[in-house]
């Protein structure tokens, strides 16, 4: 059976485009399997993974992919160009940065060719699911005999984040953390000499240009205090 | 896994009212396009109604339409269908789905318009 996706253009007797198909409407059979889910994540704002679990699937079964964006001038209905496999069986896709609209709504659809029923439509909001690379670059500058600032750079736009710094002593069994607004940097105003510091840092999209719940991943961490260098007392760049 | 209930028919005289709701779990509702699909007696699948993620889109069958509203609350992942003005023809079990033409072996809830 060939299917037709149609494309929305907002109206109201045309908003069933994001549900519609062309697909036998007689069959007394009208229990399926649901599709797995589709997750979303945008890399940094370079490019973006749609995944499903394709392991879910009863039978291995090479599910299809279309996407568009709701109400706005990229409302065609594009294909995955780029699919991502497991097992050689479709598990997601890739689209890449010039096919990326934050600040539009995101409407994915995924659909078992084989049996074209199985048809779900999802929107998300893609300003809620950026995931910032890894902070770069930590710096730590002794501004006085008890003060430290950690410094750090992000591969993005910096007032778009902000960022949680955990730090502990080798004496320590946990991590102290702070959080961070887009300012990326932070001062510890008391620092015990005889100890030995380690600082990292993540990064989140978040409040300013999306409401995104998920961290980077962790930095390099970064250590201070004793058995640093003493060249320089008063810049430390040393990463584990 | 995925799971959605489907509750509030019963047995109305044609001209009454009766409001469906779907509790769902196992999934991001949320983000999630959801019908309301129907089975008469010995007929096949018809949809009816149709909600987009944040509730701002919704599009009808044109025998429901200006009877028939659906919505959602996705703060307690649940769809609804109210339904005004009954006719005998109305009468099937009600479906919700995140399929258009098919469901995910819920139960349905059976609707009755007879006088």
């Known amino acids: 059976l060939n299917t037709t996706i149609l494309t929305p253009n907002g109206n109201e007797d045309t908003t069933a485009d994001f549900f519609l198909t062309t697909m036998p409407t007689d069959s007394l059979s009208v229990s399926t399997l649901p599709l797995p889910e589709v997750q979303c994540f945008v890399f940094n704002v370079e490019y973006m993974n749609c995944t499903w679990n394709s392991s879910s699937e009863p039978q291995p079964t090479n599910l299809t992919l279309h996407y568009w964006y709701k109400n706005s001038d990229n409302d065609k209905v594009q294909k995955c160009s780029h699919y991502l496999f497991s097992e050689e069986i479709t598990s997601g896709c890739q689209l890449q940065k010039k096919e990326i609209h934050l600040y539009q709504t995101f409407v994915v659809q995924l659909q078992d060719p084989r049996e074209p029923r199985r048809q779900a439509t999802q929107m998300l909001k893609l300003q809620n699911l950026v995931i910032p690379w890894a902070p770069e670059n930590l710096t730590l500058h002794k501004l006085s005999e008890s003060q430290l600032e950690l410094n750090w750079n992000n591969r993005f736009l910096n007032h778009c984040l902000e960022h949680l710094v955990q730090y502990r002593t080798d004496w320590d069994h946990s991590w102290t953390e702070q959080s961070v607004d887009y300012r990326h940097k932070f001062s510890l105003p008391s620092v015990d000499g005889q100890k030995r510091y380690t600082f990292r840092v993540r990064s989140r999209f978040n409040p300013l240009c999306g409401s995104a719940q998920h961290w980077s991943e962790w930095s390099h961490p970064i250590h201070w205090g004793s058995n640093t260098s003493k060249e320089n007392p008063f810049l430390f760049a040393l990463e584990a | 896994q995925v799971q959605l209930q489907e509750s509030g028919g019963g047995l109305v005289q044609p001209g009454g009212s009766l409001r469906l709701s779907c509790a769902a779990s196992?999934?991001?509702?949320?983000?999630?396009?959801m019908n309301w699909v129907r089975q008469a007696p010995g007929k096949g699948l018809e949809w009816v109604s149709g909600?987009?993620?944040?509730?701002?889109?919704?599009t009808y069958t044109d025998s429901v339409k200006g009877r028939f509203t659906i919505s959602r609350d996705n703060a307690k992942n649940t769809l609804y269908l109210q339904m005004n003005s009954l006719k005998p023809e109305d009468t099937a079990v009600y479906y919700c789905s995140m399929f258009r033409m098919a469901t995910t072996g819920s139960q349905g809830t059976q609707v009755t318009v007879s006088s």
């Open positions: 196992g999934f991001t509702f949320s983000t999630y396009v």
């Open positions: 909600i987009d993620s944040d509730g701002d889109s919704t």
